[in-house]
C-alpha cells in the first residue's frame, strides 16, 4: 500500500511541478522593473524568455517578441534551452510514469517492468527539476549581475541638470514559480525512485502459511529459503514477489503436494 501511495504521490507532485515549469517558461514576468527609486511609475516594464512587455498606468499593455535568435544573449538562449529540456524530459517522464502506476493495469505487464518504468520516470523527473532550477538560477544570477552593474552607473548626468534614469530589473514572479516547480518535480522524481525500490522484485525469505483440513494436525508449507538452496517446492527458482500491498491469498506460489487434500 505504501509503495502505491508513494508512487501515486510522486506522480501527482511531478505533474504539478511540470505544469509549473511550463507556466514559468511561458510567463512574461521573469524580470520586472525595480520600483525602488520610483514606486509610482506610470510605465512598468517586465520581460520574459520570449518577449518583453510594457504596461502603462492607462491600462494599455504592449508586448514585443524577441524576433531574433542570433541577437539574443547567450545566457538567455541557455535558459530557454534548459527550460525546454526540462519540459520535454518531464513530459516523457509523465507519459512513462502513467504506464508505470501500480493502480493502472495494462495487459499482463510484469511488476519488474513497472519497477523499471517507475525508476526511469523518477530519473527523468529529477533531471527535469534540476534543469528548471538551473535555468531559473542562471537567469536570476544574470539579473543580479545586471542589477548591480546598472546601480553602479544609475544616473548618467547630462549637462549637469538633466538625468537619464537607467531601468533596473529585479526578480519576477516566474523565477519563484520556476524554483518551486523545479523543486516539486525533483521531489516527485525522488518519490518515484523510492517507490521503485518497493516495487523491485526481490525474493522473500518466507512464504505464506497454508493450512489443510485433514484432522486437527496442521501441515506447514515447506520452503521459504532462498531459491538457490533447493529447499521447498519452488524448484523452478521462480522469484516470488510480494508487491507490498498484497494479502496472503494473493501471493503467487506454485502448488506443492501438501496444498491439496
Amino acid at each position: 500500500m505504501a509503495v502505491t501511495a508513494c508512487q501515486g504521490l510522486g506522480f501527482v507532485v511531478s505533474l504539478i511541478g511540470i505544469a509549473g515549469i511550463i507556466a514559468a517558461t511561458c510567463m512574461d514576468q521573469w524580470s520586472t522593473q525595480d520600483l525602488y527609486n520610483n514606486p509610482v511609475t506610470a510605465v512598468f516594464n517586465y520581460q520574459g524568455l520570449w518577449r518583453s512587455c510594457v504596461r502603462e498606468s492607462s491600462g494599455f499593455t504592449e508586448c514585443r517578441g524577441y524576433f531574433t535568435l542570433l541577437g539574443l544573449p547567450a545566457m538567455l538562449q541557455a535558459v530557454r534551452a534548459l527550460m525546454i529540456v526540462g519540459i520535454v524530459l518531464g513530459a516523457i517522464g509523465l507519459l512513462v510514469s502513467i504506464f508505470a502506476l501500480k493502480c493502472i493495469r495494462i495487459g499482463s505487464m510484469e511488476d519488474s517492468a513497472k519497477a523499471n518504468m517507475t525508476l526511469t520516470s523518477g530519473i527523468m523527473f529529477i533531471v527535469s527539476g534540476l534543469c528548471a532550477i538551473a535555468g531559473v538560477s542562471v537567469f536570476a544570477n544574470m539579473l543580479v549581475t545586471n542589477f548591480w552593474m546598472s546601480t553602479a552607473n544609475m544616473y548618467t548626468g547630462m549637462g549637469g541638470m538633466v538625468q537619464t534614469v537607467q531601468t533596473r530589473y529585479t526578480f519576477g514572479a516566474a523565477l519563484f514559480v520556476g524554483w518551486v516547480a523545479g523543486g516539486l518535480t525533483l521531489i516527485g522524481g525522488v518519490m518515484m525512485c523510492i517507490a521503485c525500490r518497493g516495487l523491485a522484485p526481490e525474493e522473500t525469505n518466507y512464504k505464506a502459511v497454508s493450512y489443510h483440513a485433514s484432522g486437527h494436525s496442521v501441515a506447514y508449507k515447506p520452503g521459504g529459503f532462498k531459491a538457490s538452496t533447493g529447499f521447498g517446492s519452488n524448484t523452478k527458482n521462480k522469484k516470488i514477489y510480494d508487491g507490498g500491498a498484497r494479502t496472503e491469498d494473493e501471493v503467487q506460489s506454485y502448488p506443492s503436494k501438501h496444498d491439496y487434500v
Epitope: C53, S58, Q166
Partner: antibody, heavy 118, light 113 residues
Framework: DVQLVESGGGLVQPGGSRKLSCAAS????????MHWIRQTPEKGLEWVAY????????YYADTVKGRFTISRDNPKNTLFLQMTSLRSEDTAMYFC???????????WGQGTLVTVSA | DIVMTQSPSFLTVTAGEKVTMSCRSS????????????LTWYQQKPGQPPKLLIY???TRESGVPDRFTGSGSGTDFTLTISSVQAEDLALYYC?????????FGAGTKLELK
Amino acid sequence: DVQLVESGGGLVQPGGSRKLSCAASGFTFSGFGMHWIRQTPEKGLEWVAYISSGSRPIYYADTVKGRFTISRDNPKNTLFLQMTSLRSEDTAMYFCARFYYGNSFDHWGQGTLVTVSA
Amino acid sequence: DIVMTQSPSFLTVTAGEKVTMSCRSSQSLLNSGNQKNYLTWYQQKPGQPPKLLIYWASTRESGVPDRFTGSGSGTDFTLTISSVQAEDLALYYCQNAYSFPLTFGAGTKLELK
C-alpha cells in the same frame, strides 16, 4: 460619442468641503483609468489625482494628498473628487479626463469652476 | 518630480508659416522597455478643455491634421506645425507621461502677427 460632464463646482469658504462629480457616457467607463486635472491662469495645468479602472491604485499630487479623495462608481459611470480643508490656492477649473494610450488624456470634460474665498 | 520647460512662451506667426515649439524635461522620458518617449502634446483654445494632439512624442491622435508633427527623444522634444492655419492659434502644452506626478509645461501661446 465619448462625453464627460463635471458638476459640483461653486463658491466655498476656506477650510470648507466640496464634492465634484464627473458623469461619463459613450464608452465602457469601468475599462478606463480616470483623472482630475485643474487649471489656473497662474499655474496652468496641474494634475490632481488618478484612479485606475478597478479603483486600485490611486495616486495624488503632493499638494492635495490627505485633503482630496478620488473615487468612482463604475455601475453608475461616475467619477468623484471629495475635497476637504480647501485653500485659496485650490481655486481652479477642475477637469475630469480619461486615461489613454501613452498615458495621455484623450477626452476631457468641459470643467467645473471651484472658487475658494471668504 | 519631472519638470517640463516649454519655449518660447509666446510665438507670433503668420498664416501658412512653419512653426516649431520646444519642450524640455528634467529627466529622460524614454522608456527602455519599448523605446518609446512618454511625452504628450495638447492644444487648448480659449474657453475649451485641452485637446490631445500627439502621444508617445510622435504618434498623432486620430483626427489630428498631419500638419502637426511631434519629434525628439530623451529630454528634448519639438512640436512642428508645417503650415499654420487660423484655427491653430491656441495654447500648446507638453506633458510628462512617464512618471507620477504627471506634469505639464507652462505652455506656448501661438498668436497671429
